[in-house]
């Protein structure tokens, strides 16, 4: 499928406006500190240089790869060395080192601004004065701050976006209308952006050989109809779209996307049940609600795995014959059948499967030796199955605010070397589980609640990893994963961590934490009660929740004070007094 | 191979206009001046040697350091083997040394460090 230009067959397959925005992602999500309007005359350059390919695809530069001719464009940037300092370095190299080298230098925790939103009939004039450029800065400002972040579902998402203004702008109480359909969106592209960094984090630090895997287990789960021929299939070109995105190619990811949707509604009696409505949508909602289709229902009368993964004495040989082929069909036929089970718990059954096979293929009676194979998944089963019950439980008696403070406590006591913002988000995050899966039935529970933890515990990997500080975190990051979360829940009070000195300044707090949104509020008690955790490890529950009563009644009392900051000035001193007496500091 | 030799610099007064020349010469046989990347640069008193504006092979593509957008303008002739910079509104900070530099990189990188070939360089004061 060699085309003469790459540069015109994308832009054709594409069109102009999916084109731009792509280019535009790709640039912002490369150099994140670059004003808007640098970006907007890279990408118009790019632009206009593609439609000359297209004219001509034999013109000068048309056959040039597009890692060389976007990597060309980027390293024109007057002030890339400034700005980037050794970022700048990449561009003394050919491709395709020059374009690993950009990966490299992603920053999943850029140092920009929060986007603070402006008042709603600031951005309805922003958007009915130019239209255009006010999508393209949506793009920008989401692309630089989620440098991985899933490009044709951006698309998506900046669709909603202007679908939101057109029709809120026009409504009577235009803020009514618009605020939650922003806040939807925020939420749903935090949630986005942290899943796809799970699966980019998945194929560039555990391999293709490890997303594959997990793909083969959960379109297993979301299409048990299909024969494992056709859920092959599909591994095989999703793993190659994630493999694009996640490499910055966002044009061939996209177009191979819309591929893949295509063929997936041309095949859907194969496939599933649950397509038919997706498949009427145009692509970029068609794209977003294939990814999101409920679980087909399971065929009628499944025969036991026993028979051909245990009974069979064909087990070594077919093994032998082609390792990942028989594992993947294991992994397909246990994850058809379990729904109800996370895809981390059904990778880590085919994990101990692919174990005991290698040991027992080797042993004088393999039989003999792989015949209790199942029994050993019980244990496995069991762990998830009761941790989700327990903290279910927690979440149920305790809110979740107070749920997540149990977390926080909980984290920061391992790894309290971790930094204080991540320890807030990380654990805020975790904390969401509660809201987010206890609510579902017992069948539901556990591929919502461990597959989520998953995606709020590569967040902390991928930051960490931007600083490593803790090497208890390292290891859990590293080592598996699959076994992350089990590694997380296992880790005990850090025992080597010597408390942090104590700062009155941390615990200084003004009259504007009146004026904060309450969820503000609360990441301002969480930060100060990680703070506390720092300062005293082996501080109790009780201990904790005495302080953390007494912060936010001293919270309540300034804020309706005349003299707010007096108030915060002396009652605080009065706060931190007390709080040291009740901890001994 | 390229030799460059800058022109046009000199005592300016604020307000007022630049307009420095490039001649390049000593091409390798084979070798045109369209096959190279080109870029100006300044360096004042005490400062590093910092990049103004840089412009690909053809000339379709500039870019521009923020302190000079909006009033200079790099361009250049090909059929004369010649790079020009034009600055408007000049100001006391805009006084420096001015380099003209080559690329083999055709689309006239950012960086400074992949330019290898250098003019003397020309000397810009703006005073009154």
């Known amino acids: 499928d060699a085309h003469k230009s790459e540069v015109a067959h994308r832009f054709k397959d594409l069109g102009e406006e999916n084109f731009k925005a792509l280019v535009l992602i790709a640039f912002a999500q490369y150099l994140q500190q670059c004003p808007f309007e640098d970006h907007v005359k890279l990408v118009n350059e790019v632009t206009e240089f593609a439609k000359t390919c297209v004219a001509d695809e034999s013109a000068e530069n048309c056959d040039k790869s597009l890692h060389t001719l976007f990597g060309d464009k980027l390293c024109t940037v007057a002030t890339l060395r400034e700005t980037y300092g050794e970022m700048a370095d990449c561009c003394a190299k050919q491709e395709p080192e020059r374009n690993e080298c950009f990966l490299q230098h992603k920053d999943d925790n850029p140092n920009l601004p929060r986007l603070v939103r402006p008042e709603v009939d600031v951005m309805c004039t922003a958007f009915h004065d130019n239209e255009e450029t006010f999508l393209k800065k949506y793009l920008y400002e989401i692309a630089r701050r989620h440098p991985y972040f899933y490009a044709p579902e951006l698309l998506f998402f900046a669709k909603r976006y202007k679908a939101a203004f057109t029709e809120c702008c026009q409504a009577a109480d235009k803020a009514a209308c618009l605020l939650p359909k922003l806040d939807e969106l925020r939420d749903e592209g935090k949630a986005s952006s942290a899943k796809q960094r799970l699966k980019c984090a998945s194929l560039q630090k555990f391999g293709e050989r490890a997303f594959k895997a997990w793909a083969v287990a959960r379109l297993s789960q979301r299409f048990p109809k299909a024969e494992f021929a056709e859920v092959s299939k599909l591994v095989t070109d999703l793993t190659k779209v994630h493999t694009e995105c996640c490499h910055g190619d966002l044009l061939e990811c996209a177009d191979d996307r819309a591929d893949l949707a295509k063929y997936i509604c041309e095949n859907q009696d194969s496939i599933s049940s649950k397509l038919k409505e997706c498949c009427e949508k145009p692509l970029l909602e068609k794209s977003h609600c294939i990814a999101e289709v409920e679980n087909d229902e399971m065929p009628a009368d499944l025969p036991s795995l026993a028979a051909d993964f245990v009974e069979s004495k064909d087990v070594c040989k077919n093994y032998a014959e082609a390792k990942d082929v028989f594992l993947g069909m294991f992994l397909y036929e246990y994850a058809r059948r379990h729904p109800d089970y996370s895809v981390v718990l059904l990778l880590r059954l085919a994990k101990t499967y692919e174990t005991t096979l290698e040991k027992c293929c080797a042993a004088a009676d393999p039989h003999e030796c792989y015949a209790k194979v199942f029994d050993e998944f019980k244990p496995l089963v069991e762990e998830p199955q009761n941790l989700i019950k327990q903290n279910c439980e927690l979440f149920e008696q305790l809110g979740e605010y107070k749920f997540q403070n149990a977390l926080l406590v909980r984290y920061t006591k391992k790894v309290p070397q971790v930094s204080t913002p991540t320890l807030v988000e990380v654990s805020r995050n975790l904390g969401k589980v509660g809201s987010k899966c206890c609510k579902h039935p017992e069948a539901k529970r556990m591929p919502c609640a461990e597959d989520y933890l998953s995606v709020v515990l590569n967040q902390l990997c991928v930051l960490h990893e931007k600083t490593p500080v803790s090497d208890r975190v390292t290891k859990c990051c590293t080592e598996s994963l699959v076994n992350r979360r089990p590694c997380f829940s296992a880790l005990e009070v850090d025992e080597t961590y010597v408390p942090k000195e104590f700062n009155a300044e941390t615990f200084t707090f003004h009259a504007d934490i009146c004026t904060l949104s309450e969820k503000e509020r609360q990441i301002k008690k969480q930060t100060a009660l990680v703070e506390l955790v720092k300062h005293k490890p082996k501080a109790t529950k009780e201990q904790l929740k005495a302080v953390m009563d007494d912060f936010a009644a001293f919270v309540e009392k300034c804020c309706k004070a005349d003299d707010k900051e007096t108030c915060f000035a002396e009652e605080g001193k009065k706060l931190v007094a007390a709080s040291q007496a009740a901890l001994g500091l | 191979e390229v030799q460059l030799v800058e022109s046009g610099g000199g005592l300016v007064q604020p307000g007022g206009s630049l307009h420095l020349s490039c001649a390049a010469s000593r091409l390798t046989t084979g070798v045109t001046f369209s096959d190279y990347g080109m870029a100006w640069f300044r360096q004042a008193p005490g400062a590093e040697r910092e990049l103004l504006a840089n412009i690909n092979w053809s000339g379709q593509y500039t870019n521009y350091r923020d302190s000079v957008k909006g009033r200079a303008a790099i361009f250049r002739d090909n059929a004369k083997n010649t790079l020009y910079l034009n600055i408007n509104s000049l100001k006391a900070e805009d006084t420096a040394v001015y380099y003209c530099?080559?690329?083999?990189?055709?689309?006239?990188?950012?960086?400074?460090?992949?330019?290898?070939?250098w003019g003397q360089g020309t000397q810009v004061t703006v005073s009154s």
């Open positions: 530099a080559a690329s083999s990189r055709k689309y006239g990188p950012g960086i400074k460090s992949q330019y290898e070939w």
